[in-house]
C-alpha cells in the first residue's frame, strides 16, 4: 500500500522462516494479534504471535521447520493473515498472497574470519546461513569496512556481483584497527531485499616494519 502508516510486510529466508512486520497507526497496544500462514499446496499451516517492536509496529517469525529444511518452493503461494482478538472471536486485519521466492531476505552471513592480514591488506572470508540450494551461485554480496574516525554510514560499499565468500581489502593503513561487515542478496525475486549486515569482524593490520618506507 502507498499509505506508509499501515503495512503488512513479510520476507522468506529461503528455507524455513517467514518473518513478518505489521505496522498500524492507532492500533490497540494490548490487543492479542497473530499471523496465520496457509500454503496453497502444503498440508501444514503455521501461526506466530505478533509482539510489539515499537509504538505502532509488531513482528513475528513463522517457523516452518528445521532451520535448513526446504519448506517452500518457487511455485508455492502462502496466504498470510493478521488476526486480532476482539472479545471471543478473531478478526482479520490484513491479508496477502505471499510468494516466498519473490520476497526473499536471507539470514546475515556468519563465520566471518581473517584468513590473512598484512600491513596494507586483509583477506576475509565468511559463510552464508540457511540459504536455499535453489540459488546455486545466483547471489550477490555487499561489504563495508569501518575506518577509525568514521561511521558505518560513511563507509563505501564494495559490491561482489557473484557468489564469492571472501574479499581482499587493499590500501589499508598499517597498525590500524578496522571493522568489517558483509550482507547477501539473491538475484531472484521482485521484492527481494538485502539480508541484515553480518556481525562486525574486528581486525588490525600489521605494523609497518621499522626502517621500511610506508
Amino acid at each position: 500500500a502507498v499509505n506508509g502508516t499501515s503495512q503488512f510486510t513479510c520476507f522468506y529466508n529461503s528455507r524455513a522462516n517467514i518473518s513478518c512486520v505489521w505496522s498500524q497507526d492507532g492500533a490497540l497496544q494490548d490487543t492479542s494479534c497473530q499471523v496465520h500462514a496457509w500454503p496453497d499446496r502444503r498440508r501444514w499451516n503455521q501461526t506466530c504471535e505478533l509482539l510489539p517492536v515499537s509504538q505502532a509496529s509488531w513482528a513475528c517469525n513463522l517457523i516452518l521447520g528445521a532451520p535448513d529444511s526446504q519448506k517452500l518452493t518457487t511455485v508455492d503461494i502462502v496466504t498470510l493473515r493478521v488476526l486480532c482478538r476482539e472479545g471471543v472471536r478473531w478478526r482479520v486485519m490484513a491479508i496477502q498472497d505471499f510468494k516466498p521466492f519473490e520476497n526473499l531476505r536471507l539470514m546475515a552471513p556468519i563465520s566471518l574470519q581473517v584468513v590473512h592480514v598484512e600491513t596494507h591488506r586483509c583477506n576475509i572470508s565468511w559463510e552464508i546461513s540457511q540459504a536455499s540450494h535453489y540459488f546455486e551461485r545466483h547471489l550477490e554480496f555487499e561489504a563495508r569496512t569501518l575506518s577509525p574516525g568514521h561511521t558505518w554510514e560513511e563507509a563505501p560499499l564494495l559490491t561482489l556481483k557473484q557468489k564469492q565468500e571472501w574479499i581482499c581489502l587493499e590500501t589499508l593503513t598499517p597498525d590500524t584497527q578496522y571493522e568489517f561487515q558483509v550482507r547477501v542478496k539473491p538475484l531472484q525475486g521482485e521484492f527481494t531485499t538485502w539480508s541484515p549486515w553480518s556481525q562486525p569482524l574486528a581486525f588490525r593490520t600489521k605494523p609497518a616494519a621499522l626502517g621500511k618506507d610506508t
Epitope: A1, V2, N3, T5, S6, Q7, F8, T9, W22, S23, Q24, W38, D40, I77, T79, R81, V82, V92, M93, A94, I95, Q96, D97, K99, F191
Partner: nanobody
C-alpha cells in the same frame, strides 16, 4: 498504476440479487488484493469484502457475510461482487479498490479506487 472500472449497479427490490463487476488493468494487478467498499448517503465509506488475486482467499464484513460473495476471474482481470437477499440498508455507492505491494496492514486502506457504481434497494 492500476485502473478500476465498476459496472452493474442499479435499482432493485428488497430480497433481489445483483452482480457488480470491476474490470482491472495495470502492471501490478496480478499481485493485488482487490476489494469492494460502499458509501451510503451521509455515511462514511465502509469495507465490504476483499479477495487475494492469486489464491482467491476472501474476507467479508460481518454485515454482508452469507449474503455477498466476492470472486475473481484472472483471465478477464475482473472482480465480482454477487449480492443476494438485498436490504434497504445495502443502498450505497459501491467502490472497487486495489491494494498493491507493500500490502496494507488495514483492510480499509487501499491504493487505487474506482469511481463507483450506485446500488439502490427499494422496499
Amino acid at each position: 498504476q492500476v485502473q478500476l472500472v465498476e459496472s452493474g449497479g442499479g435499482l432493485v427490490q428488497v430480497g433481489d440479487s445483483l452482480r457488480l463487476s470491476c474490470a482491472a488493468s495495470g502492471r501490478t494487478v496480478g499481485s493485488a488484493n482487490m476489494g469492494w467498499f460502499r458509501q451510503a448517503p451521509g455515511k462514511e465509506r465502509e469495507f465490504v469484502a476483499v479477495i487475494t488475486w492469486s489464491t482467491g482467499s476472501t474476507v467479508y464484513a460481518d454485515s454482508v457475510k452469507g449474503r455477498f460473495t466476492i470472486s475473481r476471474d484472472n483471465a478477464k482481470n475482473t472482480v465480482y461482487l454477487d449480492m443476494s437477499s438485498l436490504k434497504p440498508e445495502d443502498t450505497a455507492v459501491y467502490y472497487c479498490a486495489a491494494d498493491v505491494y507493500p500490502y496494507s496492514g488495514n483492510l480499509n486502506i487501499m491504493d487505487y479506487w474506482g469511481k463507483g457504481t450506485l446500488v439502490t434497494v427499494s422496499s
